[in-house]
Interface confidence: medium
């Protein structure tokens, strides 16, 4: 009797997922000498152990604890950049501003960035056909639980002034349902974090509105203030110029507002 594989609504595991994770791990540890001690084979074994043979709708943060332990990394707690719905620009920024870090600049974030994975209950197979979709199937799936776990830990580690890059082109500039809105905001530690500074990135060249007055930003300010953390907000009207000025701060055109 053929055993019918569970059909999920989301895309299946990324092609050559094990190789990609292992290759990324080695590359990361080579580029970051402070992580040279990490045994990438053990990292892969721990990653695999978090979801293989488990029902892909029944994954817990505990499943990822062995991986979290192996990937423990100290980043400067006052140099953390969070982002929501504007990943590419955030990554371009930290590529230039090398002393600041997004989650994807850490080992665990780098390993999983843009990848999808899931297994099947009671078999050692990786499911390359389909994986659960967060909305249509279940929220406790391997990918969602992974990002919830690493995002929580990343936010908990932050201190002093924490920056967040937000997409001003979206209808909800601050979205309570995003990873930032549902996980990171609530795990910033008031005893360590003094200020959350939002950078609202404008999309249109002619957009001169003050998006810091947007209702969703006011909602974010309210949530943050209730947590005894100060809030500030800046409009980034010209993201291209912003990046250019990060690269060349002495440029004369960089004194004006960006």
């Amino acid at each position: 009797v053929p055993r019918w594989r569970q059909q999920w609504s989301g895309p299946g595991t990324t092609k050559r997922f094990p190789e990609t994770v292992l290759a990324r791990c080695v590359k990361y540890t080579e580029i970051h000498p402070e992580m040279r001690h990490v045994d990438c084979q053990s990292v892969w074994d721990a990653f695999k152990g978090a979801f293989i043979s488990k029902h892909p709708c029944n994954i817990t943060e505990e499943d990822y604890q062995p991986l979290m332990k192996l990937g423990t990394q100290t980043v400067p707690c006052n140099k953390i950049l969070l982002w929501s719905r504007i990943k590419d620009l955030a990554h371009q920024f930290t590529q230039v501003q090398r002393d600041m870090f997004t989650l994807e600049d850490t080992l665990l974030g780098y390993l999983a960035d843009d990848l999808t994975w899931c297994g099947e209950f009671n078999t050692s197979k990786i499911n390359y056909q389909s994986c659960p979709d967060w909305r249509k199937d279940c929220s406790n799936n391997p990918v969602s639980v992974f990002w919830k776990t690493v995002s929580r830990r990343f936010a908990e580690a932050a201190c002093d002034v924490v920056h967040v890059m937000l997409n001003g082109s979206r209808s909800k500039i601050f979205d309570k349902n995003s990873t930032f809105g549902s996980v990171e905001v609530h795990n910033l530690q008031p005893e360590k974090v003094q200020t959350l500074e939002a950078w609202v990135i404008h999309g249109g060249r002619e957009d001169s509105r003050d998006l810091c007055q947007d209702p969703t930003i006011k909602e974010l300010e309210s949530i943050i203030s209730k947590r005894n953390i100060q809030f500030s907000c800046k409009n980034i009207y010209r993201p291209d110029k912003f990046l250019q000025c990060v690269k060349n701060p002495e440029d004369s055109s960089c004194t004006s507002e960006i």
Partner: antibody, heavy 121, light 107 residues
Framework: QVQLVQSGAEVKKPGSSVKVSCKAS????????ISWVRQAPGQGLEWMGG????????VYAQKFQGRVTITADESTSTAYMELSSLRSEDTAVYYC??????????????WGQGTLVTVSS | EIVMTQSPATLSVSPGERATLSCRAS??????LAWYQQKPGQAPRLLIY???TRATGIPARFSGSGSGTEFTLTISSLQSEDFAVYYC?????????FGQGTKVEIK
């Protein structure tokens, strides 16, 4: 048996570019890092950069950043190194070399035969 | 970047004698060090990796030692085919860097 076969010698004018290829056979091309190492006449070895074909994200030595482009084509198991804005000091034998372990960039256990690039006006 | 310094630049040895080559790193490279042999007109050949592990097919007369910043390659009894240039290379920190080489010549 792993073999790395490089393209033939090139003579180039200053300011131009050169693209050297390195075709691999045997082993899994995608998983082993390929590096490029050059050796000027009578001089030592100099690492230029490397790539894990599966990832397609090269890493370059600072000295060559902006002038060198390393790529890999998994479908043909071929790695490429392009060096632009050539000057006479770039006259050298250029080697491709494969990492000793899967996924790791070094040390190098397999080497191409070398490609002599001469830059002269 | 890590600077690798080899000494001596040239070593004159008689066949059958022992040769000792040194390599110093400007900062610790742990045991992530390799030794290569290169003969004129040929590509380098990996001899030792991990500071002390012989690569496949390398004769037992070649041995490596050291860790951190000081490394040694020893050829216990030089054969005629061992006269060549030897390079050390660190692969602990990007960019990988090589020493300037030690030429082992016939005395």
């Amino acid at each position: 048996q792993v073999q790395l076969v490089q393209s033939g010698a090139e003579v180039k004018k200053p300011g131009s570019s050169v693209k050297v290829s390195c075709k691999a056979s045997g082993g899994d091309f995608s998983l082993y890092a390929i590096s490029w190492v050059r050796q000027a006449p009578g001089q030592g070895l100099e690492w230029m950069g490397g790539i894990i074909p599966l990832l397609g994200e090269p890493v370059y030595a600072q000295k060559f950043q902006g002038r060198v482009t390393i790529t890999a084509d998994e479908s043909t198991s071929t790695a490429y190194m392009e060096l632009s804005s050539l000057r006479s000091e770039d006259t050298a034998v250029y080697y491709c070399a494969r990492g000793h372990r899967v996924y790791s960039s070094s040390p190098f256990d397999y080497w191409g035969q070398g490609t002599l690039v001469t830059v002269s006006s | 970047e890590i600077v690798m310094t080899q000494s001596p630049a040239t070593l004159s040895v008689s066949p059958g004698e022992r040769a000792t080559l040194s390599c110093r790193a400007s900062q610790s490279v742990s045991s992530n060090l390799a030794w290569y042999q290169q003969k004129p007109g040929q590509a380098p050949r990996l001899l030792i990796y991990g500071a002390s592990t012989r690569a496949t097919g390398i004769p037992a007369r070649f041995s490596g030692s050291g860790s951190g910043t000081e490394f040694t390659l020893t050829i216990s009894s030089l054969q005629s085919e061992d006269f060549a240039v030897y390079y050390c290379q660190q692969y602990n920190n990007w960019p990988w860097t090589f020493g300037q080489g030690t030429k082992v010549e016939i005395k």
